[in-house]
């Protein structure tokens, strides 16, 4: 049903919404944090331009009475009964930040009339592509799969000279949030993923992932994989891996790898990570003071989801045109805004655009080197260390199948 | 952050037994692994001993069969026995981990082995 918004008249509302599901488990106050600093940069940047309106965020809560598991498993209804609160209520803003959950997003989009926008910090699965008021700040399944594919298909780099057609997947149900959707998206076989490999098989018992690094009949040398070394650890151990295995660490929202003294652990040797750029000066910000490495990201997605409002309303405003109107809705996309930490490019379905960084360890000084970084906006691969001291022969990437001649 | 605090060390005769222990700020089993090094006067560090969180251990081939790592799991703590002492084992021992991202080193603790 139509909700009236609380979006006129020189007052502009954000409906945030706080739930107790989320795709990571940071606390709501520091969420609720990065809304109000990212609600004092607005006010002073439309200020700067001018434009003399009130911007207010209304934080809803869930009551956690049913839907309480804390991650994402029970958050298919905990959206529509918070949806539902803000209707009775009668405070719908004028877009609403809020679920991270794909279930979450999912569902809401598909049981409610948007006529506003929505604005998501994560919601990463396929089921959320392609939605036509819906925002997210956080690389999306498709995004990754996109440089899996670019990266397979490359072969005329100097450390790698093979196309690969082939792939293992770990995946065995225990995945955070984002990993589990992104690795949802390499298993679905409908995928763009599945589509363009010739061979993938999906490993979910640890003994299937731990006989693969030692079997002389595996089927690929390639084992996709989703979390940070300490996951890889536990899973491989101290274990043997053949000389011409690559384990692809898909590890995006971990800022870790680029702050100083981190020296990488042997069993990383084998493995190339894959992670986002960071931001210039999000590792020593106030902002990002108070949260862990692997957090920064989701509250900056809920600062800069602030910060989009802000440069929509701007525009609108100073073009004269109303803001509770389906045009307003669906102008979330095809654009750049000024984030918290510099140009924020969102593509033409609303899913922000990003520098990904694959990163391999040098055998000489156990540190973790740029190999090469990856635009999601321009689908384009750019080499970045030309002689890499690899573990591997020849300091090249192996061939995706033992055996096979140069293709 | 982990914090490594050595202690054991002294003076022994040839031929004697020393332990040495590692105290570890942190749950021994969250990080990667811990390792014994010992540095002799204007010589380099060198690896002596090492244990993963894996199970794993390993020895320098100088101190294989008179050295043996070990931990006490609730007390976070790792030792390194020392038996069948030499002149040659005369060094600083200092205990090394890594959680996994980065490395940390203890302060150090004297052995010295002489009559």
């Known amino acids: 049903s139509q909700v009236s918004q609380n979006c006129h008249n020189g007052s502009y509302e954000i409906s945030v919404l706080m739930m107790g599901n989320s795709a990571f488990a940071e606390p709501l106050k520091n969420l609720e944090d990065a809304v109000n600093e990212g609600l004092e940069i607005v006010r002073g940047r439309l200020q700067n331009a001018g434009l003399n309106v009130t911007v207010n965020a209304t934080f809803m809560y869930s009551d956690g009475l049913i839907h309480n598991s804390g991650d994402c498993r029970s958050s298919t209804c905990e959206g529509l009964d918070l949806l539902r609160k803000i209707s009775n209520a009668q405070r719908m803003g004028c877009v609403l930040i809020g679920p991270s959950c794909t279930y979450s997003t999912f569902q809401m989009y598909l049981d409610t009339e948007l006529s506003y926008p929505m604005i998501s910090a994560g919601s990463f699965g396929l089921s959320c592509d392609y939605k036509e008021t819906l925002t997210r700040l956080m690389s999306p399944a498709r995004k990754l799969m996109y440089f899996l594919v670019n990266f397979w298909k490359t072969n005329d780099l100097p450390f790698k000279t093979y196309s690969w057609s082939t792939s293992y997947v770990y995946k065995n149900g225990t995945e955070t949030e984002d990993c589990f959707w992104y690795l949802n998206a390499l298993e679905a076989s409908v995928s763009y993923f599945s589509h363009e490999l010739g061979f993938k098989v999906v490993l979910r018992q640890d003994k299937e992932f731990q006989d693969i690094l030692m079997d002389h009949n595996r089927k690929s040398n390639v084992i996709i994989m989703c979390g940070g070394p300490e996951f890889l650890y536990k899973l491989k151990g101290d274990r043997a891996v053949a000389e011409d295995i690559v384990i692809i660490l898909v590890d995006l929202f971990n800022d870790q790898y680029f702050e100083d003294n981190v020296t990488a652990p042997d069993y990383m040797k084998n493995v190339l990570v894959l992670t986002l750029s960071p931001g210039n000066s999000l590792l020593n910000s106030s902002f990002s003071r108070n949260l862990s490495p692997t957090k920064r990201d989701f509250a900056l997605a809920y600062l800069n989801g602030i910060l989009l409002f802000g440069h929509m309303l701007k525009i609108f405003l100073e073009n004269g045109e109303n803001i509770t109107t389906p045009k307003f809705a669906h102008a979330f996309r095809n654009l750049t805004f000024e984030g918290y930490d510099g140009p924020v490019t969102l593509d033409d379905w609303g899913d922000v655009d990003s520098t990904m960084v694959l990163l391999y360890t040098s055998v000489d000084t156990k540190k973790y080197k740029v190999l090469l970084t990856y635009d999601t906006h321009v689908n384009k691969t750019y080499p970045v260390d030309m002689s890499p001291t690899f573990t591997w022969k020849n300091s090249k990437l192996p061939n995706d199948i033992t055996g096979r001649g140069p293709q | 952050e982990v914090r490594l605090v050595e202690s054991g060390g002294g003076l022994v005769q040839p031929g004697g037994s020393l332990r040495l222990s590692c105290a570890v700020s942190k749950n021994i089993f969250s990080i990667y692994r811990v390792d014994w090094y010992h540095q002799a006067p204007g010589k380099q560090r060198e690896l002596v001993a090492g244990w993963t969180s894996g199970g794993s251990t390993s020895y320098a081939d100088a101190v294989k069969g008179r050295f043996t790592i070990s931990t006490d799991n609730v007390k976070d703590t790792v030792y390194l026995q020392m038996n069948s002492l030499t002149p040659e084992d005369t060094a600083v021992y200092y205990c090394?981990?890594?959680?996994?991202?980065?490395?940390?080193w203890g302060q150090g603790t004297q052995v010295t082995v002489s009559s």
């Open positions: 090394h981990a890594h959680d996994h991202w980065r490395d940390y």
